[in-house]
C-alpha cells in the first residue's frame, strides 16, 4: 500500500528533473526568452544573441559615439546626443559607452526646454527696467520696472535698477529730477542765482566807481589855498580779491552742455558717467 505513492513520488521527481517547470520570472539582471532566463547585457554593451541551453548571452560593446546606460537586451546602442554649436549648444560632459553626452548653452544663452535641445539668447532688460533675476543655463532673465527713486539707462541682461543720486548728502541741490531712465542732476546751492547776481554786482560796482571818478574830476574846483601839498588823483587799481572772487576758495568753472558748472574746491573735477552720456 505504501509502494504506490512512493513510486508516484519518485516518478514525479524524475519527471520534474527532466522537464523543469518553465520559469515565470527571472532574477535581477536576467530576462526571460524561449522559456529560459538569460543574462542581460551590462551598460555600455548591446545584445548580439540570446543565451541557449548551452551558451551564455552574447554581448558587444557599443561603438564610438554610442551608449546604453542600463542592463539591457537592446540590439542597437543609442547615438550620443549632438550638442549642435549652431544652436548655441556646447558639450558640458562628453558621453561614454554608458552615458549620453550632456549639452548646455553657451554663455549668454539658455535652454529652450528641459532636454536642452536648443538655446536662445538671454533677454536684456531695456532702459527703465532692471534685472530682477539673472538668467541661468535653463531660465531667462527676469526684468522689473524701476520704481520711483531708481533708474536704468541701459539695455542689459545683468544690470539692476540703480538708486537716484542723493544730492543732499553731497551738499548739492537737485537741478533736474530723475526718471525711471535717468538719474537726477545735482548742482551747487543757488548756482543759477550766483551766476546772474555776480556779474550784475560787478557791473554796478564798476559803474559807481566810474561815476565817482567822473564826479571827483569834474566837480572838484581848483583853489589857491593849499595848506597841504596838492595830492595827485590816485590811479584806481582793481584788486584781484574784489567781492565775488574768493582767493581762499578758488572756483573752477567747467563748461558742460554749454552751461558753466561750478566745481567746488576740494572736490575732484570729474564729470559723472551719467552726465557724460
Amino acid at each position: 500500500m505504501v509502494r504506490l505513492p512512493l513510486q508516484c513520488v519518485l516518478w514525479g521527481c524524475l519527471l520534474t528533473a527532466v522537464h523543469p517547470e518553465p520559469p515565470t520570472a527571472c532574477r535581477e539582471k536576467q530576462y526571460l526568452i524561449n522559456s529560459q532566463c538569460c543574462s542581460l547585457c551590462q551598460p555600455g554593451q548591446k545584445l548580439v544573441s540570446d543565451c541557449t541551453e548551452f551558451t551564455e548571452t552574447e554581448c558587444l560593446p557599443c561603438g564610438e559615439s554610442e551608449f546604453l546606460d542600463t542592463w539591457n537586451r537592446e540590439t542597437h546602442c543609442h547615438q550620443h546626443k549632438y550638442c549642435d554649436p549652431n544652436l548655441g549648444l556646447r558639450v558640458q560632459q562628453k558621453g561614454t559607452s554608458e552615458t549620453d553626452t550632456i549639452c548646455t548653452c553657451e554663455e549668454g544663452w539658455h535652454c529652450t526646454s528641459e532636454a536642452c535641445e536648443s538655446c536662445v539668447l538671454h533677454r536684456s532688460c531695456s532702459p527703465g527696467f532692471g534685472v530682477k533675476q539673472i538668467a541661468t543655463g535653463v531660465s531667462d532673465t527676469i526684468c522689473e520696472p524701476c520704481p520711483v527713486g531708481f533708474f536704468s539707462n541701459v539695455s542689459s541682461a545683468f544690470e539692476k535698477c540703480h538708486p537716484w543720486t542723493s544730492c543732499e548728502t553731497k551738499d548739492l541741490v537737485v537741478q533736474q529730477a530723475g526718471t525711471n531712465k535717468t538719474d537726477v542732476v545735482c548742482g551747487p546751492q543757488d548756482r543759477l542765482r550766483a551766476l546772474v547776481v555776480i556779474p550784475i554786482i560787478f557791473g554796478i560796482l564798476f559803474a559807481i566807481l566810474l561815476v565817482l571818478v567822473f564826479i571827483k574830476k569834474v566837480a572838484k574846483k581848483p583853489t589857491n589855498k593849499a595848506p597841504h601839498p596838492k595830492q595827485e588823483p590816485q590811479e584806481i587799481n582793481f584788486p584781484d580779491d574784489l567781492p565775488g572772487s574768493n582767493t581762499a576758495a578758488p572756483v573752477q568753472e567747467t563748461l558742460h552742455g554749454c552751461q558753466p558748472v561750478t566745481q567746488e574746491d576740494g572736490k575732484e573735477s570729474r564729470i559723472s558717467v551719467q552726465e557724460r552720456q
Epitope: 554649436p85 549652431n86 544652436l87 548655441g88 556646447r90 558639450v91 562628453k94
Partner: antibody, heavy 117, light 106 residues
Framework: QVQLVQSGGGVVQPGRSLRLSCAAS????????MHWVRQAPGKGLEWVAV????????NYVDSVKGRLAISRDNSKNTLFLQMDSLRPEDTALYFC??????????WGQGTTVTVSS | SYELTQPPSVSVSPGQTASITCSGD??????ASWYQQKPGQSPVLVIF???RRPSGIPERFSGSNSGNTATLTISGTQAMDEADYYC?????????FGGGTKLTVL
C-alpha cells in the same frame, strides 16, 4: 556622389564687393549646417562663418563681422557668402564645407578671392 | 580668446608611428577633429569627435583627446601621408583651427 562646387571668386579692389556661391549635390542640403573656411596664401585654415540648416542662425569670426554675410537657399541647394567692404587681408582661397559631428566632412574645391588695388 | 596650438613640423620615417599634438585649455572637454591637406587640394576630414574615422580613411589613422591635448596618431606611416594636418574644435559657438603641422615622411 556628395559634392560641393564653388564659384564667384576673382580679383577685386579694396572696398568693393564680391559674392561667392557653393552648389551642393548628392545629399539633403537642408539637413546640414554649412561653413565657409578660408586660407590665405601660404597660411593655415581660418574658419569664417557658419549658418544653421534652416538659415535661422549664423555666426562669424570677429574679423569679418559686419562685412561678410553667410546665407543659403535650400530650394536651390546653394550656400552664399556676400563679401562687402573687402580688404587686402581678405585675400585667400575660400572653401565651403558641410558640418558634421563637430567637424566638417565634405569640402568644396575652393575659390580664390584677391583684393588688390 | 581660445587658441589651439600645434607644432609647426613633425618628421617620421616610413613605417614608423607619427604623433601630432594639438593643445588648448581644457581641450579634453571639447570634441576635436583632424584634417589632412595636401598641396593644391582641399582639406580632408580624417578624424572627428576625438577618435571616430570617416568611411574611407585608413585604420592607421587614430585620435585621442584628454586633458589639454588632442593627438592624431598615424601608425605605419606611408609616403602618401606627407601633408599638412590641422586640428579643429568649437569654442563659444565658433569653430577654431590649429596653426597646422607639416608632416614630413623621411
Amino acid at each position: 556622389q556628395v559634392q560641393l562646387v564653388q564659384s564667384g571668386g576673382g580679383v577685386v579692389q579694396p572696398g568693393r564687393s564680391l559674392r561667392l556661391s557653393c552648389a551642393a549635390s548628392g545629399f539633403t542640403f537642408s539637413s546640414y549646417a554649412m561653413h565657409w573656411v578660408r586660407q590665405a596664401p601660404g597660411k593655415g585654415l581660418e574658419w569664417v562663418a557658419v549658418i544653421s540648416k534652416d538659415g535661422s542662425y549664423e555666426n562669424y569670426v570677429d574679423s569679418v563681422k559686419g562685412r561678410l554675410a553667410i546665407s543659403r537657399d535650400n530650394s536651390k541647394n546653394t550656400l552664399f557668402l556676400q563679401m562687402d567692404s573687402l580688404r587686402p587681408e581678405d585675400t585667400a582661397l575660400y572653401f565651403c564645407a558641410r558640418d558634421y559631428w563637430y567637424g566638417m566632412d565634405v569640402w568644396g574645391q575652393g575659390t580664390t578671392v584677391t583684393v588688390s588695388s | 580668446s581660445y587658441e589651439l596650438t600645434q607644432p609647426p613640423s613633425v618628421s617620421v620615417s616610413p613605417g614608423q608611428t607619427a604623433s601630432i599634438t594639438c593643445s588648448g585649455d581644457k581641450l579634453g572637454n571639447k570634441y576635436a577633429s583632424w584634417y589632412q591637406q595636401k598641396p593644391g587640394q582641399s582639406p580632408v576630414l580624417v578624424i572627428f569627435q576625438d577618435s571616430r574615422r570617416p568611411s574611407g580613411i585608413p585604420e592607421r589613422f587614430s585620435g585621442s583627446n584628454s586633458g589639454n591635448t588632442a593627438t592624431l596618431t598615424i601608425s605605419g606611416t606611408q609616403a602618401m601621408d606627407e601633408a599638412d594636418y590641422y586640428c579643429q574644435a568649437w569654442d563659444s559657438s565658433t569653430a577654431l583651427f590649429g596653426g597646422g603641422t607639416k608632416l614630413t615622411v623621411l
